[in-house]
């Protein structure tokens, strides 16, 4: 607890002080006071620098004195033998004695009192900026007229802050301009204009004279302009060193004028005005601005239109133009919007074809569709090349945005059939020789695939079973092989309207119009073992002549067994219809004369016992296309015969092409159109 006075005595005083003692006293008087410490008695063993025994006076980190020996007063009217005056309110006294004293020393007696200090004069650093007033225990600062004391109670300044300028034009000057500005002041001026206008400050060089910078280049007095996060300055010196025209790009400007205690000059004067906020004429690639102007300011509106092949993407919506407004902050609205190249996106995939992954899907990019060759070809032309058009669509020169269509190649076996002599009298065949061959398992029969969705067969095959199970792609009809091949599911069976349905089909003698179509539920995927046969053309080129050769195939009866396990085939010549009429029916169910022969029938066979037989019904009689030797077309369908191993009768497909096309067209799916 601070005290105003006190006494300090060495140990055992006035008796001799003991050896090996170290004792300290912490003196503290109230703040605002100094300490007067005086000794009235001093008797301590003398040594050089008081190294043996001593009394030490410390103020803060400073040693004020170190005493030893004997002292007597120089003034007969005063008992004081040594005294110390410190302007601080704390002092430490330390007494030390060593291990031996040659004589008897009595030590010391000392007293301290709190003394007033003159803060205004006693310190190097003057506490007040202007007037200092001392009183016992303290001081206070005061200011000249028109100055006020700052909150720190030490510094005086002029009251030059708080002015807010809102007019679109104005003039501001430092206090007393052109007389010297006040020292030790911070003047803040605020310019606040309507949003959309920027503050433009203009100065003349000669209207500026502020105390110059120090040797380190730091302004002692300074003028600073602050506009948002941008700062201009600090400026100082004789003549304005900054730009004479400052475009702040802001409607709010703070002017800060800071002065120190020394070196007052005449100060400064400036003019300001509000400019409509300019917006930069931005270079927006791939677009045109409307209207085109040299300068755009607050509230100007432009329409930015993208060039062809470019679009503005906002969210998921693409547009070709947008509006932008020059805003109050000097920035364009919608500035994030850009004219980007139109993106046509990942091209749609097509059935039975592919499109290479494009390097780019942007405007001008090119892609190529191809069909899965050699089993499919591009039906609707156009070459398959599409480019990304300005409207965001992939476009072909011929088809426009319509996608190419890959349709099965017909009539081309992967491997040609080679007779290995030995169907009746025929040879072993591979399904790759007859990829159009369809197997019906109930009844055991055949058919011909004519496109992805349709199978052609004989009417008598399907008349008793309108939901036949069919298989494609297998040479063998062992159950194990068929299980691994492609099973076709019928959607509907269409029997030719001219086919006469009988209650007892076994007794049939009229096989006229023995033709039917089976519409499939799902499209067939073509490949080396599955691919359609062509239909005949309607021109006379497709009229068969006697002796024309055709191929038949199937799993019907052979000389060796009632059903073939592996596909058999034979090459047969077309014969005159009378040759078939002349053959005696093997197991007639009626009078021989009752059997009907019509122009809708083809007679073929008669050579080397090669013929179709029970179980081959519905299979194609395949003839080389007269206009394209690489292809086969279905000239006939295995229909009936008087006797296996002689001549057989085949439905003449050419006579039914119109019915086939009409039936398929009327019963196609939208996906096929």
């Amino acid at each position: 607890e601070p005290t105003m006075y006190g006494e300090i005595l060495s140990p055992n005083y006035p008796q001799a002080y003991p050896s090996e003692v170290e004792k300290s006293w912490d003196i503290e008087v109230p703040e605002g006071y100094g300490i007067h410490l005086y000794f009235t008695h001093l008797d301590i063993e003398l040594s050089e620098n008081c190294a043996y025994d001593s009394v030490q006076i410390i103020s803060g980190d400073t040693e004020e004195g170190r005493l030893c020996g004997q002292r007597s007063s120089n003034n007969p009217h005063s008992p004081i033998v040594e005294e110390f005056q410190v302007p601080y309110n704390k002092l430490q006294v330390i007494f030390k004695s060593d291990f031996s004293n040659e004589e008897r020393f009595t030590g010391f007696a000392a007293y301290y009192v709190a003394t007033d200090i003159n803060e205004c004069t006693d310190f190097v650093d003057v506490p007040c900026s202007h007037f200092c007033n001392n009183f016992i225990g303290g001081y206070f600062c005061s200011c000249p007229p028109e100055y006020f004391l700052h909150d720190d109670m030490k510094n005086c300044g002029v009251n030059c802050s708080g002015d807010v300028f809102t007019a679109l034009i104005g003039e501001i000057a430092s206090p007393n301009y052109p007389k010297p500005y006040p020292e030790n002041s911070r003047c803040e001026y605020q310019i606040r204009l309507e949003k959309g206008f920027q503050v433009v400050v203009t100065l003349r060089r000669e209207d500026f004279d502020v105390e110059a910078a120090d040797s380190a280049g730091n302004c002692l007095d300074s003028l600073v302009f602050v506009a948002g996060d941008r700062q201009f300055g600090p400026y100082c010196g004789h003549g304005f060193p900054g730009p004479l025209n400052i475009e702040t790009k802001s409607n709010a400007l703070d002017i800060i004028f800071q002065t120190d205690l020394t070196g007052q000059k005449k100060g400064w004067k400036l003019r300001y005005h509000g400019d409509p906020m300019p917006c930069p004429k931005e270079d927006t690639p791939n677009s045109v601005w409307e209207p085109a102007k040299a300068k755009y300011v607050f509230r100007d509106v432009v329409q930015i239109t993208c060039l062809d092949g470019f679009e503005v993407v906002e969210g998921r919506v693409g547009a070709t133009s947008f509006y932008s407004t020059c805003q109050s902050n000097g920035k364009w609205s919608n500035s994030k919007l850009k004219c980007q190249p139109v993106d046509c996106g990942i091209p749609e995939s097509i059935e039975n074809g592919k499109v290479e992954d494009p390097e780019s899907t942007l405007f001008g990019s090119v892609i190529r569709y191809t069909c899965e060759e050699p089993y499919y070809y591009m039906e609707n032309g156009g070459g398959g090349e599409y480019h990304c058009a300005g409207n965001g669509s992939w476009v072909n020169e011929v088809l426009g945005p319509e996608l190419p269509k890959c349709v099965p190649v017909c009539g081309v076996p992967r491997e040609p059939f080679e007779e290995k002599q030995r169907i009746i009298g025929g040879s072993d065949a591979d399904i790759k020789n007859f990829p159009w061959q369809v197997f019906f398992d109930n009844p055991w029969a055949g058919g011909a695939l004519i496109n992805e969705y349709w199978v052609l067969t004989a009417a008598h095959v399907v008349e008793g079973n309108r939901e036949p199970t069919m298989y494609v792609g297998s040479t063998s009809v062992q159950t194990s092989r068929l299980a691994k091949s492609k099973m076709l599911t019928p959607e509907h069976v269409f029997i030719h309207p001219g086919w006469k349905l009988l209650e007892v089909p076994e007794g049939r003698t009229n096989f006229d119009n023995d033709i039917a179509l089976v519409r499939l539920k799902d499209p067939v995927k073509m490949g080396p073992t599955v691919s359609p046969i062509c239909l005949p053309g309607t021109s006379s080129d497709y009229n068969l002549m006697d002796g024309d050769l055709g191929l038949i195939s199937g799993w019907g009866r052979t000389e060796k067994r009632d059903r073939a396990v592996r596909l058999k085939a034979a090459r047969l010549p077309v014969a005159p219809l009378r040759k078939c009429k002349e053959v005696k029916v093997e197991k007639p169910t009626a009078d021989a004369e009752a059997y009907v022969f019509t122009p809708n029938m083809i007679c073929a066979g008669g050579e080397k016992g090669m013929d179709s037989c029970k179980g081959d019904s519905g299979g194609a009689f395949a003839v080389q296309d007269p206009n394209d030797k690489t292809k086969f077309y279905a000239a006939g369908l295995v229909s009936w015969g008087p006797q296996c191993g002689t001549y057989g009768l085949y439905t003449r497909v050419k006579n039914y092409v119109d019915w086939i096309m009409k039936t398929m067209q009327e019963n196609s799916t939208p996906r096929e159109d």
Partner: antibody, heavy 125, light 107 residues
Framework: EVQLVESGGGVVRPGGSLRLSCAAS????????MSWVRQAPGKGLEWVSG????????GYADSVKGRFTISRDNAKNSLYLQMNSLRAEDTALYYC??????????????????WGKGTTVTVSS | DIQMTQSPSSLSASVGDRVTITCRAS??????LGWYQQKPGKAPKRLIY???NLQSGVPSRFSGSGSGTEFTLTISSLQPEDFATYYC?????????FGGGTKVEIK
């Protein structure tokens, strides 16, 4: 050459078990169904069991149902007959035979076109 | 189960004779029937399948006929190597059943 060779026969006590095997060669084993047929000494032929090409369908004679199990391992070209709870009346020469199965959903069987030489099973106490 | 009744159970014939063996099914089996020949100490051998189809490699003197419930195996001219036991087999449905057999002996 198409060949079927049976093995695994032998003498076993009533109630005992045996496993017969039939090794096939000279044809694609997994394209055919297979059958077991037995012939008791001096008696006629009796069909025992049959299995289709992939092992998903089996059939048994009433006399062996619940005691015998037919199976196949197509990877090993082998047919098996596991015989449990054997009785004296199971004593016979056991043949394996090949069955041809044609067609899809509606199929046509041609049974037992190729036979093995047989393996003898004797059940006696 | 379908019962197959074969007759006669045995017959004596001479070389060159025409021999007929009959098999009767207890219910209709369409033409799902085969004929087998077995010689003593040998495995059976298929002669006919699907009632009337001659197995490849089998002499043409053997023939089969019939449908439904009545079936016949005919040997048009008996040869010395034809003396054996003949079985019919129905495969219309499980369980498959053989006829009791017909033993053809030399007269």
């Amino acid at each position: 050459e198409v060949q079927l060779v049976e093995s695994g026969g032998g003498v076993v006590r009533p109630g005992g078990s045996l496993r017969l095997s039939c090794a096939a060669s000279g044809f694609t084993f997994d394209d055919y169904g297979m059958s077991w047929v037995r012939q008791a000494p001096g008696k006629g032929l009796e069909w025992v069991s049959g299995i289709n090409w992939e092992g998903g369908s089996t059939g048994y004679a009433d006399s062996v149902k619940g005691r015998f199990t037919i199976s196949r391992d197509n990877a090993k070209n082998s047919l098996y007959l596991q015989m449990n709870s054997l009785r004296a009346e199971d004593t016979a020469l056991y043949y394996c035979a090949r069955d041809e199965q044609l067609g899809g959903i509606k199929y046509y069987y041609y049974y037992m076109d190729v036979w093995g030489k047989g393996t003898t099973v004797t059940v006696s106490s | 189960d379908i019962q197959m009744t074969q007759s006669p159970s045995s017959l004596s014939a001479s070389v060159g004779d025409r021999v007929t063996i009959t098999c009767r099914a207890s219910q209709g089996i369409r033409n799902d029937l085969g004929w087998y020949q077995q010689k003593p100490g040998k495995a059976p051998k298929r002669l006919i399948y699907t009632a009337s189809n001659l197995q490849s490699g089998v002499p043409s003197r053997f023939s089969g006929s019939g449908s439904g419930t009545e079936f016949t195996l005919t040997i048009s001219s008996l040869q010395p190597e034809d003396f054996a036991t003949y079985y019919c087999l129905q495969y219309k449905q499980y369980p498959l059943t053989f006829g009791g057999g017909t033993k053809v002996e030399i007269k």
